[in-house]
């Protein structure tokens, strides 16, 4: 190598990461196997759960503003879940990115796209509910499914825009032990006259901007919307939170718990540029909190189901009935199970004034099983607690 050979310029923290070597420690290998297993399971669960949510909410329910929000959240989570198998592969081959630079950029971008999209969509849901309560007349006139879709498109565009720097500055870096990292390289584009200054300013800018835009601002919007709604409903003498409120509260709590640690470590990482003593903590903690953030996409569909009232009781009670009705022949569909469903349907209709499904006919065979898997939320049109939970938006 010549004296002036251009080594790829790396920020100090990144160069030090490239110097970390793998251990052949047995206990560490067991942890790696467990991590691969856990991420593989999460990949599968995330894809199936979010796929089912998209199918049921998108195809088997009448489209409302609320189902639109859930649909887009599930789409974001499905994208993230679809990228998880590649992260699992990265873990399986010994924490080495073997899929090339372009795919490294794309894979990482999906993670950040999900981060921004989730934050923005949860903000929109909270603002939507706030407007319904604080400006009911305006909401009545302007709150349409088409408008919600347009808002979602704008939010997706904003999320994509915010993801661009993460796409640009993602790179594959060879470690000294032969493994390949897929990580930030903020010196990749126009490093400027002073690398140290560029490293510091860009790392801080990325960490602070994502913390503010994808976490703090959305949580502030959610909190202030909730406060405004609570104040208004207090005046109306309402005490018990509605079903949709519980669903949103659960999803927001999961968002805060899953993404909060990631942002803390991301800020610590930016601080570690000037304070190398923080680096070991960041190196140890970041993989765990990144996985936790990924798992948010797996947790959300579970929350949609679990926030259905009487869910577990209904599941236990209807297990035998559902299995019977799924296994009966199409010619036998006029029997007792069917009439029992029709009775439930009428009570559900009286419980919620809204028609909740775009298909009036009884779903058959696999569709019914899918519905049951979702906790009877969409097993038959216009029944099911999820339908009601997703509809009673002002409660």
């Amino acid at each position: 190598m010549s004296a002036n050979a251009t080594l790829k310029p790396l920020c100090p923290i990144l160069e030090q990461m490239s110097r970390l070597q793998s251990h052949s420690n047995t206990s560490i290998r067991y942890i790696d196997h467990a991590a691969v297993l856990l991420h593989g399971l999460a990949s599968l669960l995330g894809l199936v759960e979010n796929g089912v949510i998209l199918f049921v909410v998108g195809c088997r329910m009448r489209q409302t503003v609320v189902t639109t929000w859930v649909l887009h959240l599930a789409l974001s989570d499905l994208l993230a879940s679809a990228s998880l198998p590649f992260f699992t592969y990265f873990l399986a081959v010994g924490h080495s990115w073997e899929l090339g630079t372009t795919f490294c950029k794309l894979h990482s971008s999906i993670f950040f796209l999900n981060m921004f999209a989730s934050g923005f969509l949860l903000s929109a849901i909270s603002l939507d509910r706030c407007l319904q309560v604080v400006r009911p007349v305006w909401a009545q006139n302007h709150r349409t499914v088409a408008a919600a879709h347009k808002v979602c498109l704008v939010l997706w565009a904003l999320a994509v825009l915010n993801t661009v720097p993460y796409f640009v500055f993602r790179d594959t870096i060879s470690r000294l032990d032969g493994r390949i990292m897929c990580y930030y390289n903020v010196l990749l584009l126009n490093p400027g006259p002073d690398r140290d200054a560029t490293c510091n300013s860009r790392q801080v800018a990325l960490a602070v901007s994502k913390f503010l835009l994808a976490f703090l601002v959305p949580l502030a919007i959610i909190a202030s919307s909730h406060a405004a709604v609570s104040l208004r409903l207090q005046h109306r003498g309402r005490r018990r939170p509605g079903r949709f409120v519980r669903l949103v509260a659960a999803v927001v709590a999961a968002f805060a718990l899953c993404w909060g640690p990631y942002h803390v470590f991301s800020l610590l990482e930016a601080r570690a540029h000037a304070n190398p003593g923080l680096r070991p903590l960041v190196w140890r903690g970041l993989p765990f909190v990144t996985s936790l953030a990924f798992f948010n996409s797996v947790a959300n569909p579970v929350l949609y189901v679990l926030t259905c009232p009487d869910m577990l009781r209904k599941l236990r009670r209807s297990l035998r009935t559902v299995l019977e009705s799924v296994l009966v022949d199409d010619s036998e569909l006029g029997g007792a199970g069917s009439s029992r469903r029709r009775r439930t349907s009428s009570t559900a209709r009286s419980a919620s004034p809204l028609a909740l499904c775009s298909r009036p006919e009884e779903p058959r065979g696999p569709a019914r099983l899918l519905g049951w898997l979702l906790g009877s939320c969409a097993a038959s049109p216009q029944t099911g607690p999820l339908n009601r939970a997703l509809s009673s938006t002002s409660s």
């Epitope: 004296a3 920020c11 006259p193 200054a197 190398p276 003593g277 070991p280």
Partner: antibody, heavy 118, light 107 residues
Framework: EVQLVESGGGLVQPGGSLRLSCAAS????????MSWVRQAPGKGLEWVAY????????DYPGTVEGRFTISRDNSKNTLYLQMNSLRAEDTAVYYC???????????WGQGTLVTVSS | DIQMTQSPSSLSASVGDRVTITCRAS??????LAWYQQKPGKAPKLLIY???QLASGVPSRFSGSGSGTDYTLTISSLQPEDFATYYC?????????FGQGTKVEIK
């Protein structure tokens, strides 16, 4: 060929000042971080100052902080070390060294001797 | 500050001998260690960087190993030109400190 040539050493009284220079050639000076390292007669090596490639970041060990100042002029391909309030224990051969990347001194000058004595 | 303790401080060996010099840091330095060779009246020369990586133009008889706090420089077959003083230096947290040196002399 990479060359680092130090100059400015000499005899100085305790409490006095001295400015060392290091002329660089054979590489793109503005692309590399630089350091000064010293070696007291018959003793080991001691790192004394660091400066980033653009000059925005400097660092010093506690033994010289506040007394020594590292700087660079990328247009002149020159590194400097301003030494104030010199003490007898600062007597050493001072080397300028180029950082391979962020660390690791891959090229050194031949050194200049600084003697602090009354 | 991180202390670097080199051992032995001096050793006598013959041409063709296998020589091992160790360097212990007072805390984990995560492979951020370099080894230098210095001959009398000359500037130090980089041999090994990042604990295990051979610097450009350095003969393959030199090798580095170790992790955490303990690192080793090995000369597999000592040559006449290898009689010199060897220093380790960490690049973890500033101040970047050197070991006190190991003088390799002819037996």
């Amino acid at each position: 060929e990479v060359q680092l040539v130090e100059s400015g050493g000499g005899l100085v009284q305790p409490g006095g000042s001295l400015r060392l220079s290091c002329a660089a050639s054979g590489f793109t000076f503005s692309s590399y971080s630089m350091s000064w390292v010293r070696q007291a007669p018959g003793k080991g090596l001691e790192w004394v100052a660091y400066i980033s490639n653009g000059g925005s970041t400097t660092d010093y060990p506690g033994t010289v902080e506040g007394r020594f100042t590292i700087s660079r002029d990328n247009s002149k391909n020159t590194l400097y070390l301003q030494m104030n309030s010199l003490r007898a224990e600062d007597t050493a051969v001072y080397y300028c060294a180029r950082h391979r990347t962020n660390w690791d001194f891959d090229y050194w000058g031949q050194g200049t001797l600084v003697t602090v004595s009354s | 500050d991180i202390q670097m303790t080199q051992s032995p401080s001096s050793l006598s060996a013959s041409v063709g001998d296998r020589v091992t010099i160790t360097c212990r840091a007072s805390e984990n330095i995560y492979w951020n260690l370099a080894w230098y060779q210095q001959k009398p009246g000359k500037a130090p020369k980089l041999l090994i960087y990042a604990a295990t990586q051979l610097a450009s133009g350095v003969p393959s008889r030199f090798s580095g190993s170790g992790s955490g706090t303990d690192y080793t420089l090995t000369i597999s077959s000592l040559q006449p030109e290898d009689f010199a003083t060897y220093y380790c230096q960490h690049f973890w947290i500033t101040p970047w400190t050197f070991g006190q040196g190991t003088k390799v002399e002819i037996k």
